[in-house]
Amino acid sequence: KAMHVAQPAVVLASSRGIASFVCEYASPGKATEVRVTVLRQADSQVTEVCAATYMMGNELTFLDDSICTGTSSGNQVNLTIQGLRAMDTGLYICKVELMYPPPYYLGIGNGTQIYVIDPEPCPDSD
């Protein structure tokens, strides 16, 4: 009955503070409405990074002010988180909810450890 969610164990953000990873879920049923949430877990505290609800076959749309973007293809969601800094290094969990039709299913990934390294400032060139 449980829905399995797979995501990579580790991802290194780019020098521009962008990290991308795939969140894949094994849908027990034929969902038409799916909610994807990215959560950050630090010191056992969990906070929401971003969330989007989409209809199967349609594009994934995050809020305009979201730091996340994404695309969906079948049971796979390609997530990109932007504007990351070294202090944002942590475990990012992909949560998937099959909202419709019934029954509802919840899937929680094991999390992706995202490492963010702030770029060294360019040396002044005289």
Partner: antibody
């Protein structure tokens, strides 16, 4: 701090209606799914109904399907349970509960008692 | 529907003793989707354990959860006077959300 406060309970005759409310505060209400759970006197916990973030998706226990309606007003941070065709077996304390980020019910209200009796 | 069966129905123990509560599911429940709650008379339930073994905020480390598949356990390593209560397991991986019938931990 997170607070859930139920109201609207009372004594009602079989077949009549009652409307329960749950006022939420201390968190971004629209970011959480919500539930109603009930507990008959001296009995265990029974899940009653669920509502999604935007209120578009609702699920009900078979025992209340077609009689109870859950709704939410995200602008007023309020969860509502409309109960019609009440039966003596609906007598219980009704709790509203918030779904935590990882799925369990992390915060509960203090409950409101509904007694269905003639 | 996933049916959860808790045992024993009542556990009579003394403060300082170890309590072991069992929850068995009628079908496999992912360990990420199993919670334990504590309820004292006249109070709302309180989340203790989620994801089968993660303690909720503010829960003392004498409470621990374990198990996977269909068999789950809540252990209270040394019972304190405030631990005597009713404990419920719950699955939240799919609808309908279901609870076990509860285990009462009473003072012997």
């Amino acid at each position: 701090q997170v607070q859930l406060v139920e109201s609207g309970g009372g004594v009602v005759q079989p077949g009549r209606s009652l409307r329960l409310s749950c006022a939420a505060s201390g968190f971004t209400f629209s970011s959480y799914t919500m539930h109603w759970v009930r507990q008959a006197p001296g009995k265990g916990l029974e899940w009653v109904t669920f509502i999604s973030y935007d209120g578009n998706n609702k699920y009900y226990a078979d025992s209340v399907k077609g009689r109870f309606t859950i709704s939410r007003d995200n602008s007023k941070n309020t969860l509502t349970l409309e109960m019609n065709g009440l039966r003596p077996e609906d007598t219980a304390i009704y709790y509203c509960a918030r779904t935590g980020w990882l799925g369990p019910f992390d915060y509960w209200g203090q409950g409101t008692l509904v007694t269905v009796s003639s | 529907e996933i049916v959860l069966t808790q045992s024993p129905g009542t556990l009579s123990l003394s403060p300082g003793e170890r309590a072991t509560l069992s929850c068995r599911a009628s079908q496999s429940v992912g360990s990420s989707y199993l919670a334990w709650y504590q309820q004292k008379p006249g109070q709302a339930p309180r989340l203790l354990i989620y994801g089968a073994f993660s303690r909720a905020t503010g829960i003392p480390d004498r409470f621990s959860g374990s198990g996977s598949g269909t068999d789950f356990t809540l252990t209270i390593s040394r019972l304190e006077p405030e631990d005597f209560a009713v404990y419920y397991c719950q699955q939240y991986g799919s609808s309908p959300w279901t609870f076990g019938q509860g285990t009462k931990v009473e003072i012997k």
